[in-house]
């Protein structure tokens, strides 16, 4: 069998809302993946599991099941959304994200995704992780790749 390639493209959109009473930020983050099947037979994308971390804390998880099949030598682009919550011991972020005298409220999030594919009863898992900028101060739609955070290390928050 040839490889199945998973490429994390980036954040497609981030939609933000706030709970004033709880000083909580809700971010719905939609990500884009390209999955390429380099084989001469179809493969099933059985599930995608994703999680988002902020400052080493998991702030959101998602799982998509029975997603699609990819034909021989074909590629499919898949969007998936992770609902995230920034609250409690990170409620200081609410002050940053709702401070409107600054225009851009970029925070660095670590996106982790695992794709499980199956073919002929065989299962394969491919994982990727990437740091991405997301604006927590407003709803944002990104050009693919625009939100990428290029440094290897996550900055101090």
């Amino acid at each position: 069998p040839r490889s199945i390639d998973v490429k994390y493209i980036g954040v497609k959109s981030a939609y933000v809302s706030y709970d004033v009473q709880k000083r909580t930020i809700y971010l719905n983050i939609t990500n884009t993946l390209n999955i390429t099947n380099n084989n001469y037979y179809s493969v099933e994308v059985e599930n995608i599991t994703a999680q988002v971390q902020f400052a080493k804390t998991v702030i959101g998880k998602a799982r998509l099941n029975n997603i699609t099949h990819i034909g021989p030598l074909d590629m499919k682009q898949i969007d998936y959304t992770v609902p995230t919550v920034i609250a409690e011991e990170m409620s200081y972020m609410y002050d940053f994200c709702t401070l409107i005298s600054i225009k851009v409220h970029n925070i660095v999030l670590m996106m982790q995704v695992t794709v499980t594919t199956t073919y002929f009863g065989h299962s394969e898992q491919i994982s990727q992780e990437r740091y991405q900028y997301v604006d927590c101060g407003r709803n944002t739609t990104y050009q693919l790749g625009q939100s990428e955070y290029l440094n290897v290390l996550q900055p101090q928050q």
């Epitope: 004033v20 200081y92 401070l99 409107i100």
Partner: antibody
Framework: QVTLKESGPGIVQPSQTLSLTCSFS??????????VGWIRQPSGKGLEWLAK???????FYYPALKSRLTISKDTSKNQIFLKIANVDTADSATYYC???????????WGQGTTLTVSS | DIVMTQAAFSNPVTLGTSASISCRSS???????????LYWYLQKPGQSPQLLIS???SLASGVPDRFSSGGSGTDFTLRISRVEAEDVGVFYC?????????FGGGTKLELK
């Protein structure tokens, strides 16, 4: 717990430069979204914002006084400084510093320091 | 600048009854993010101001739930459900929507 304390000369002569210090504890000015602001209150009157400084060193001044004000910080010493140039009797007031934040406004205030401009 | 307007004095109120204090802004304080950037402070006699309410409706830490706030984008009301002697002072509304941040002139709570 969060505390702030203002200090100043008490009395200053007209046309001099006034220096005020705000010493704080219980929070870090390295935290995103945090800042310290200066507010003054002439005796028997209302509150007036003077200046603010944020964690990222952004500074904002009340426009009518901007040419006379300078705000700065020493994060390692947990201190904020405000200088007011060319003071006159209209600057006589109680000066407060307060911890500010985007979401919560001025959540913590110092006890204030009273300034009298007199020759 | 956004002008915050308040009456200088409240209607005289009896201890244990409710009181309302009004504030009007010259421009809507409702931001496109859904948050209204209106704040209430109380300055008790001889003391520093203290934060009561942030972003129109969020009670500050340690503030009793006798205090509540609401309003539209430009007209706001602070309500005290059962006035106590310790509530006496000057109530200031303020806005953080636009620079410069501004305070209202303050409303003095009067007891009967």
């Amino acid at each position: 717990q969060v505390t702030l304390k203002e200090s100043g000369p008490g009395i200053v002569q007209p046309s001099q430069t006034l220096s005020l210090t705000c010493s704080f504890s219980g929070f870090s000015l390295n935290t995103l979204g945090r800042g310290v602001g200066w507010i003054r209150q002439p005796s028997g009157k209302g509150l007036e914002w003077l200046a603010k400084i944020w964690w990222n060193d952004d500074k904002f001044y009340y426009p009518a006084l901007k040419s006379r004000l300078t705000i700065s910080k020493d994060t390692s010493k947990n201190q904020i400084f405000l200088k007011i140039a060319n003071v006159d009797t209209a600057d006589s007031a109680t000066y407060y510093c307060a911890r500010i934040a985007g979401g919560t406004g001025a959540a913590y205030w110092g006890q204030g320091t009273t300034l009298t401009v007199s020759s | 600048d956004i002008v915050m307007t308040q009456a200088a004095f409240s209607n005289p109120v009896t201890l244990g009854t409710s009181a309302s204090i009004s504030c009007r802004s010259s421009k809507s304080l409702l931001h496109s993010n859904g948050i209204t950037y209106l704040y209430w402070y109380l300055q008790k006699p001889g003391q520093s101001p203290q934060l009561l309410i942030s972003q129109m409706s969020s009670l500050a830490s340690g503030v009793p739930d006798r205090f509540s706030s609401g309003g539209s984008g430009t007209d706001f009301t602070l309500r005290i459900s059962r006035v106590e002697a310790e509530d006496v002072g000057v109530f200031y509304c303020a806005q953080n929507l636009e620079l410069p941040w501004t305070f209202g002139g303050g409303t003095k709570l009067e007891l009967k």
